[in-house]
């Protein structure tokens, strides 16, 4: 014969516990069911009656099965420099999360306490360890043949871009200049041609501008694209 | 007509050295970046280094800074390319490169290359 | 791994036409940076086919030509010939890099 099924409330056998979803009441001394997320008990079981469960209120939740007799109170609203990432719902809690270009500089189980801005690496630094939800931005010098011209929680240093001819040796805050136009990125005709930053890899020396067989008056400015010809001199 | 002529490559032991010639002639030497490029046997093309047309500024891929030196001659119209430290991984065709007109971001000419083997 | 998407291998018989694509990300082309195309015949020098996206250099016919859009890049060529049969290799600049990447290579076979 098949075992009986036991309803709730019912004594365990000496030595067992309680199924899933069960607890034991010390009182009654007896198996109880619990209440289900967004539930608490309103009324503890006794040896012939189980828990009486009932919904949360209004701004307040349980996440888990549980047997409280009141529901947890939802955290207070998010400050004006966090984001509601979820809702408080009778079955979670509120969770607030710094908004972009900030990290939480104090954290509490259900969230955060204190955002703070996030480190901005000024001209001549890049970001080394990018920030996160809860960690600052690290910022590096840029390294010989690399620059950074921005002030960015962002940006890396990149390399110095390559010239055919370098007109102003880049520095850590500044991309080499060309002489003769490199222009790398398409541009629309007739627009002024900035250098382009790349990133990190490269290794350069620069020591001073280079002498230029390329005439001064291409400078900076964007060519047509002209094909390999025989015997063809520089820009 | 453009002519890029590499020389220099040959076989060398793990650790050793090895000094790659570009002899280029045919246009203005010295007012383009120029380039060496390599390709291991069966793979694809990898950028090794580059140097400006006036060599106050050189520029090195990850894999062999520190290791590899770029260096031009602009009276003699040559391209260097000392490799010290060589690994097994190194060994390949290294092309030297012309840097375009305008953008030495691609290259418009190329030399016949020469194979640098590195085994012991 | 290249920084360059390519397809290892695309094949056609005479005549056909032919597209090799070249995929990268923002850092590349997806940044605006130009594209360039190479060939590389049977144990030659690699030989510069298309630069600046779509331009040809001297010499190069009107049978090949290039594109660009968005993040990727391709290489059309028309009335494919036997002479054509090489690998083929897009790059362009990177904002990760300080030299310019390659892609992976295409060998393109010409059947027949």
């Known amino acids: 014969l098949p075992a009986q099924v036991a309803f709730t409330p019912y004594a365990p056998e000496p030595g067992s516990t309680c199924r899933l979803r069960e607890y034991y009441d010390q009182t009654a001394q007896m198996c109880c069911s619990k209440c289900s997320p967004g539930q608490h008990a309103k009324v503890f079981c006794t040896k012939t009656s189980d828990t009486v469960c009932d919904s949360c209120e209004d701004s307040t939740y349980t996440q888990l099965w549980n047997w409280v007799p009141e529901c947890l109170s939802c955290g207070s609203r998010c400050s004006s420099d966090q984001v509601e990432t979820q809702a408080c719902t009778r079955e979670q809690n509120r969770i607030c999360a710094c908004e972009a270009g900030r990290y939480c500089a104090l954290k509490t189980h259900s969230g955060c306490r204190l955002c703070a801005p996030l480190r901005k690496c000024r001209p001549g630094f890049g970001v080394a360890r990018p920030g996160t939800e809860t960690s600052d931005v690290v910022c590096k010098p840029c390294a010989p043949g690399t620059f950074s011209n921005t002030t960015s929680s962002t940006d890396i240093c990149r390399p110095h871009q390559i010239c055919n001819v370098v007109a102003i040796p880049g520095n850590a805050s500044m991309d080499a200049v060309c002489t003769s136009t490199s222009p790398t990125r398409s541009m629309a005709p007739g627009a002024v041609h900035l250098p382009q930053p790349v990133s990190t890899r490269s290794q350069h020396t620069q020591p001073t501008p280079e002498p230029s067989t390329a005439p001064s008056t291409s400078f900076l400015l964007p060519m047509g694209p002209s094909p390999p010809a025989e015997g063809s001199t520089g820009d | 007509e453009v002519q890029l002529l590499e020389s220099g490559g040959g076989l060398v032991q793990p650790g050793g050295s090895l000094r790659l010639s570009c002899a280029a002639s045919?246009?203005?030497?010295?007012?383009?970046?120029m380039h060496w490029v390599r390709q291991a046997p069966g793979k694809g093309l990898e950028w090794v280094s580059a140097i400006s047309g006036g060599a106050t500024t050189t520029y090195y891929a990850d894999s062999v800074k520190g290791r590899f030196t770029i260096s031009r001659d602009n009276s003699k119209n040559t391209l260097y390319l000392q490799m010290n430290s060589l690994r097994a991984e190194d060994t390949a065709v290294y092309y030297c490169a012309k840097g375009g007109t305008g953008d030495p971001y691609y290259f418009d000419y190329w030399g016949q290359g020469t194979l640098v083997t590195v085994s012991s | 791994q290249s920084v360059l998407t390519q397809p290892p291998s695309a094949s056609g018989t005479p005549g056909q036409r032919v597209t090799i694509s070249c995929t990268g990300s923002s850092s590349n082309i997806g940044a605006g940076y130009d594209v360039h195309w190479y060939q590389q015949l049977p144990g030659t020098a690699p030989k510069l086919l298309i630069y600046?996206?779509?331009q040809r250099p001297s010499g190069v016919p009107d049978r090949f030509s290039g594109s660009k859009s968005g993040t990727s890049a391709s290489l059309a060529i028309s009335g494919l010939r036997s002479e054509d049969e090489a690998d083929y290799y897009c790059a362009a600049r990177d904002d990760g890099l300080s030299g310019p990447v390659f892609g992976g290579g295409t060998k393109l076979t010409v059947l027949g």
């Open positions: 045919g246009f203005t030497f010295s007012s383009y970046a």
């Open positions: 600046r996206n779509n």
